[in-house]
């Protein structure tokens, strides 16, 4: 069965070819300690932010 949480993400090469891979479908992010997990929207917002930061690190030609 294909991973939902542990999907290998391709390294970012350039902004144009970047795709964000997320867990598909309803995901319950609760942990063994019973914490209430993040919502899908929260996860997506964090992923977008991380992606944006990574893109900003890419040196652009002068």
């Amino acid at each position: 069965m294909r991973n939902i949480f542990k999907r290998n993400q391709e390294p970012i090469v350039a902004p144009a070819t970047t795709t964000a891979t997320m867990p598909i479908g309803p995901v319950d992010n609760s942990t063994e300690s019973g914490g209430a997990g993040e919502s899908q929207e929260d996860m997506f917002a964090k992923l977008k932010e991380k992606l944006f930061n990574e893109i900003n690190k890419i040196p652009l030609p002068p």
Epitope: R2, N3, F5, K6, G25, P26, D28, N29
Partner: antibody, heavy 118, light 112 residues
Framework: EVQLQESGAELVRPGASVKLSCKAS????????MHWVKQTPVHGLEWIGA????????AYNQKFKGKATLTADKSSSTAYMELRSLTSEDSAVYYC???????????WGQGTTLTVSS | DVLMTQTPLTLSVTIGQPASISCKSS???????????LNWLLQRPGQSPKRLIY???KLDSGVPDRFTGSGSGTDFTLKISRVEAEDLGVYYC?????????FGGGTKLEIK
């Protein structure tokens, strides 16, 4: 050698709960997800859900939400599936199968036969 | 949920003859990453399922090259060029592109 050893056959009464186990060996337990599949003559193979043993994160097929609860014990490299409020519809063979990236080696347990009968 | 429809239900084949199984999905299995997560497995009598083919056409290790998988989008086919006695059992296609993952109903291969 990767092995997934599932618990033995169970005969339980309607309304009861049961906890099936899947002990992993031959690899680092927390590096791979564990998925569970139900098999019946009527409905064939059905994907129940998955757990990431590293974080405890779970994902369920909507059909099995409220019926199945997936957990994992890192110390014993064992994944568990608890099934509650059992009915005859839950009588099936249940398999654990190791998650992959859609292309690496695929491993399945030998299956646990659950019979719900009064 | 993605409906996976397999045909035929039963296939009776003479050893040495070819066999073909069709699997159709209710929506395209092409993922956003450009890959198509369509798999085939064989369940021999009294055994656990064993994956034969992944990503439509790639053979798992140890699977004889008489097995070939093909197709794209919503239409897929598993072919056995020359059936052998060890090939009997039930063949299932399944998709893990869309959530929840779903299986075909199975095709029972019998030896004539």
């Amino acid at each position: 050698e990767v092995q997934l050893q599932e618990s033995g056959a169970e005969l339980v009464r309607p309304g009861a709960s049961v906890k099936l186990s899947c002990k992993a060996s031959g690899y680092t337990f927390t590096d791979y997800e564990m998925h569970w599949v139900k098999q019946t003559p009527v409905h064939g193979l059905e994907w129940i859900g998955a757990i990431d043993p590293e974080t405890g994160g779970t994902a369920y097929n909507q059909k099995f939400k409220g019926k199945a609860t997936l957990t994992a014990d890192k110390s014993s490299s064992t994944a568990y599936m608890e099934l509650r409020s059992l009915t005859s519809e839950d009588s099936a063979v249940y398999y654990c199968t190791r998650g992959n990236d859609g292309y690496n080696e695929d491993y399945w347990g030998q299956g646990t036969t659950l019979t719900v009968s009064s | 949920d993605v409906l996976m429809t397999q045909t035929p239900l039963t296939l009776s084949v003479t050893i040495g003859q070819p066999a073909s199984i069709s699997c159709k999905s209710s929506q395209s299995l092409l993922d956003s990453d450009g890959k198509t997560y369509l798999n085939w497995l064989l369940q021999r009598p009294g055994q656990s399922p064993k994956r034969l083919i992944y990503l439509v056409s790639k053979l798992d290790s140890g699977v004889p090259d008489r097995f070939t998988g093909s197709g794209s989008g919503t239409d897929f086919t598993l072919k056995i060029s020359r059936v052998e006695a060890e090939d009997l059992g039930v063949y299932y296609c399944w998709q893990d592109t869309h959530f929840p993952y779903t299986f075909g109903g199975g095709t029972k291969l019998e030896i004539k």
